[in-house]
């Protein structure tokens, strides 16, 4: 599930300033921990890289929705 991965107190201090093509993304995690300075999204790419992104950006929200739908459609 895109948002069910538990990353112990991982925070985003900087976010990517360019769009990542949706076909490169595998999953995401919401960061809302109180010990983090801001809410953020960590995208995991198909190459295994983790990238912080700003959930206020339209491309980030669209990518999250797309991954949610993909995940749901993969369920048996």
């Amino acid at each position: 599930q895109p948002d069910s991965v538990s990353i112990p107190i991982t925070c985003c201090f900087n976010v990517i300033n360019r769009k990542i093509p949706i076909q490169r993304l595998e999953s995401y995690t919401r960061i809302t921990n109180i010990q983090c300075p801001k809410e953020a999204v960590i995208f995991k790419t198909k190459r295994g890289k983790e990238v912080c992104a700003d959930p206020k950006e339209r491309w980030v929200r669209d990518s999250m929705k797309h991954l949610d739908q993909i995940f749901q459609n993969l369920k048996p």
């Epitope: 599930q1 948002d3 069910s4 919401r30 959930p55 206020k56 995940f71």
Partner: antibody
């Protein structure tokens, strides 16, 4: 530690307006969205709308569109909700809450607004 | 708008009981579901987001499951402090909507 502190209870006449404030500490409000949710006595929760304090962009439940104004002052880390043309059905506890994802992890203590002639 | 139907609206249970509350959306909400606990005179408290993700500090007796339109909150062994009203909320699309609530009372 995140805290959202709201203004005190209000008693208003039908047809008037009310403005409720929500002062945030422990977070930068421009990094998040500030939402307003209300709860009538003995009833459930109802989302009214939200603001992106970074740019002032707002989104509302169409039910409240035109009657509610949400603003934010980033210099004082305060969000405001003003509801106009009050009627008795607007008697409720009004909560502010934060959440960029659409769910709400921190809430104010609530402000009781009573509309009565 | 997406409507959320929660059931039951109230239930009576004893300490130690397993309690299940269900929430049904009028359309697929793709796991964008949150659960809250509210006690009288207090603001709601977030328990679960993303249908299954337990918030920090929430006891493990609370769990969430489901997908598509149908979701469940389970309290595996009810404790005295769990007597409260529980709400589900969808955050797939605005306007964000809540279920009508389930009041868990002492039997």
């Amino acid at each position: 530690q995140v805290q959202l502190v709201q203004s005190g209870a209000e008693v208003k006449k039908p047809g008037s307006s009310v403005k409720v404030s929500c002062k945030a500490s422990g977070l930068t409000i421009s990094d998040t969205y500030m939402h307003w949710v209300r709860q009538a006595p003995g009833q459930g929760l109802e989302w009214m709308g939200r603001i992106d304090p970074a740019n002032g962009n707002t989104k509302f439940d169409p039910k409240f569109q035109g009657r509610v104004t949400i603003t934010a002052d980033t210099s004082t880390s305060t969000a405001y909700m003003e509801l106009s043309s009050l009627r008795s059905e607007d008697t409720a506890v009004y909560y502010c809450a934060r959440g960029v994802f659409g769910f709400f992890d921190y809430w104010g203590q609530g402000t009781t607004v009573t509309v009565s002639s | 708008d997406i409507q959320m139907t929660q059931s039951p609206s109230s239930l009576s249970a004893s300490v130690g009981d397993r309690v299940t509350i269900t929430c049904k959306a009028t359309e697929d909400i793709y796991n964008r579901l949150a659960w809250y606990q509210q006690k009288p005179g207090k603001a709601p408290k977030l328990l679960i987001s993303g249908a299954t993700s337990l918030e920090t500090g929430v006891p493990s007796r609370f769990s969430g499951s489901g997908s598509g339109k149908d979701y469940t909150l389970t309290i595996s062994s009810l404790q005295p402090e769990d007597f409260a009203t529980y709400y589900c909320q969808q955050f797939w699309s605005a306007p964000y909507t809540f279920g009508g609530g389930t009041k868990v009372e002492i039997k």
